[in-house]
Interface confidence: low
Amino acid sequence: SAPGEDEECGRVRDFVAKLANNTHQHVFDDLRGSVSLSWVGDSTGVILVLTTFHVPLVIMTFGQSKLYRSEDYGKNFKDITDLINNTFIRTEFGMAIGPENSGKVVLTAEVSGGSRGGRIFRSSDFAKNFVQTDLPFHPLTQMMYSPQNSDYLLALSTENGLWVSKNFGGKWEEIHKAVCLAKWGSDNTIFFTTYANGSCKADLGALELWRTSDLGKSFKTIGVKIYSFGLGGRFLFASVMADKDTTRRIHVSTDQGDTWSMAQLPSVGQEQFYSILAANDDMVFMHVDEPGDTGFGTIFTSDDRGIVYSKSLDRHLYTTTGGETDFTNVTSLRGVYITSVLSEDNSIQTMITFDQGGRWTHLRKPENSECDATAKNKNECSLHIHASYSISQKLNVPMAPLSEPNAVGIVIAHGSVGDAISVMVPDVYISDDGGYSWTKMLEGPHYYTILDSGGIIVAIEHSSRPINVIKFSTDEGQCWQTYTFTRDPIYFTGLASEPGARSMNISIWGFTESFLTSQWVSYTIDFKDILERNCEEKDYTIWLAHSTDPEDYEDGCILGYKEQFLRLRKSSVCQNGRDYVVTKQPSICLCSLEDFLCDFGYYRPENDSKCVEQPELKGHDLEFCLYGREEHLTTNGYRKIPGDKCQGGVNPVREVKDLKKKCTSNFLSPEKQNSKSN
């Protein structure tokens, strides 16, 4: 039988009546155009909805937008378009929502061609009131909030000026001209690239990287010959043109650009790219594109300084610069990432790592699934996950994989079971242990979301026909109940729930179509009465994460420590609640070779935990570039994995000596850096 339809499934009592009492319809008085939805703050219940409708006239496009506000998680909406003077809002800038619970919102308005500058509407009270402000420039990008201070905003203008506001957009100052890209760093620092000779495109590879730590009073040039730059965790990366040819290399800084080191990564040519796939304060995953139009590259993982890199995964699927990659951080379990590789026969296969890129394996075949036509051996195959690439290829995949930090161990994704990703209609699979084991959860493609920290999973079938049924599960996808939320089916466009998966409300968005008109409609369902009581201690059970061999006392050790979690029992139907905090107990492990990456010049042969010297480097001195000086590395081939907390046990020797020689890096050395003040 299909998942959730066997006798073992206990039904949730009287759920139809309970849900009917908690289903709220709102019909928007709008012609169907586009709709965008933003949550304002955390646990505030405030949602802003912007609907826009374009009427293409012969000479110009006439636009109309409406703004709606809810303060009860979408159950009721109020038209507040008059608060923004019925102005047409530019949807390409979206709604700029302030960080944390600042309650700040910036909307960018469309203005007529001849105006001196743009116009914004600002709110700092969760969109209860808005202030109109005329800008002294036309914005090119959405306003960017400083992560540290939501009163500080930056924006680029259409004329490549860098503009900063210190009072939440009330007053603006142009702090630099000829700017290509600007980003907030930590401590209200702004990093930006500038061009000298004409345009960002023309000067690509000859840009300068600047920094201001005082919102434009003074500046420091921290890099030259820059192609691009990026921030990840505590790392600042710059790709820098080589002196002699058109190749470029990655340089990295951990001190805001004061000193730089050349990353031990391959250089790339004009048609190639680097991409930071993921970064935290410990390390970074870097994709390096392969030469030629291959559609793949190599993933490297960094050491704790972002300088020495280990090859993590070959033939990693990543189509083009800014293209598609399936690389996914599984946020529900530490150390887990999923991505796709392009195999020799051009089929796409899913790989998973449980130890932050140390090792990659195929996903275990779900026990309740058969191998499909892609499998050579009908008894041996793997699960392959559909993610961004499948979506971009217009396969029947409505959603990317889903995981939430507070729904420990749960991963939901579309997939197929075989030797590679199949173009056939996928099913939905769930893992409750962070990707180690999988079960088919739903037949066919669905939209899905997690509520109440995993206490409820909601799904809606992906269909071209109008729908009126929602499915929900209170036991992590084992058993499903269906609820008809309206008599009149709607064309479904999306599920919306508050980010963070703590809410018990879900909004179903869609439109109704009649002979003459179509209108936006939302149904918000509150599941609070399904989960009638608060969870108690007895509703939770102890779960050891990453457990693969319970008889091993190092079982569960990943990155030097194991974690035991209190997890909701599948059989418990109760509320985790909005204040639910994941309870975990860490325990440090003794060090083994698994806690060490292979050092620069070493690699791990397949299925071996020992690091051996790269044949091409055997007998050579290992020298690399650190802070602009050449270093000599004395190593027996191992270095501790960033973030690894193991203690005791094995302890390979590693020593770095300063060779007191300048590196052959063409990058700006510290003594050449200059500063200036405004």
């Epitope: 050891l544 061999d549 008889e551 079982d555 194991k562």
Partner: antibody
Framework: QVQLVQSGAEVKKPGASVKVSCKAS????????MSWVRQAPGQGLEWMGI????????SYAQKFQGRVTMTRDTSTSTVYMELSSLRSEDTAVYYC??????????????????????WGQGTTVTVSS | EIVMTQSPATLSVSPGERATLSCRAS??????LAWYQQKPGQAPRLLIY???TRATGIPARFSGSGSGTEFTLTISSLQSEDFAVYYC?????????FGGGTKVEIK
């Protein structure tokens, strides 16, 4: 050489608390867990709990839960076991023992248990009114 | 918790003879078992770990066997210093538990 030296004998009244120390030397203190085991007069060995010297995480036998607290001071390589609400049946010799296990809470343990290989000399605690 | 049962409670053996001590677990403990020797007024001493591996400095006359729920400690030829109480201990699942002990006395 590797050794565990415990604090001296204690006489306590019922309802009081006792805190026994165990100082480790001759090995890296944070590389091994420490278990506490007690033995009542003429009785067998009874495991009380375990502490991980690195993070200080603990796991206690259900019988002692709520009454026992195990702590450590990495600066002096010392672990402590405090037992509160003492009763006459707590009269026993209390041992600390170096334990290689990787247990946390009540989770699964070793494929290849190495045993409590180093023991303290024992601390006699007498509870009497 | 896992209950460890030792038998016999007392074993009377003459010096030079073979002694066989038994330990049974209420559920499988795999090979996660240790044996200890304790003499009066002394702390226990580790003899065997991993069910069958002798600890450092333990004479070859001591051997351990078994796996799962049934374990045996064998002393092939008893010496005078071997008369003591012997305990088995499991470390398969917390809490660790000891058997009640077997006293090996001189016959």
């Amino acid at each position: 050489q590797v050794q565990l030296v415990q604090s001296g004998a204690e006489v306590k009244k019922p309802g009081a608390s006792v805190k026994v120390s165990c100082k480790a030397s001759g090995y890296t203190f944070t590389s091994r867990y420490m278990s506490w085991v007690r033995q009542a007069p003429g009785q067998g060995l009874e495991w009380m709990g375990i502490i991980n010297p690195v993070g200080g995480s603990t796991s206690y036998a259900q019988k002692f839960q709520g009454r026992v607290t195990m702590t450590r001071d990495t600066s002096t390589s010392t672990v402590y076991m405090e037992l509160s609400s003492l009763r006459s049946e707590d009269t026993a010799v209390y041992y600390c023992a170096r334990d290689p296990s990787g247990i946390a809470l009540a989770g699964p343990a070793s494929r290849y248990y190495l045993g409590m290989d180093v023991w303290g000399q024992g601390t006699t605690v007498t509870v009497s009114s | 918790e896992i209950v460890m049962t030792q038998s016999p409670a007392t074993l009377s053996v003459s010096p030079g003879e073979r002694a066989t001590l038994s330990c049974r677990a209420s559920q499988s403990v795999s090979s996660n078992l240790a044996w200890y020797q304790q003499k009066p007024g002394q702390a226990p001493r580790l003899l065997i770990y991993g069910a069958s591996t002798r600890a450092t400095g333990i004479p070859a006359r001591f051997s351990g066997s078994g796996s799962g729920t049934e374990f045996t400690l064998t002393i092939s030829s008893l010496q005078s210093e071997d008369f003591a109480v012997y305990y088995c201990q499991q470390a398969r699942l917390g809490p660790w538990t000891f058997g009640g002990g077997t006293k090996v006395e001189i016959k």
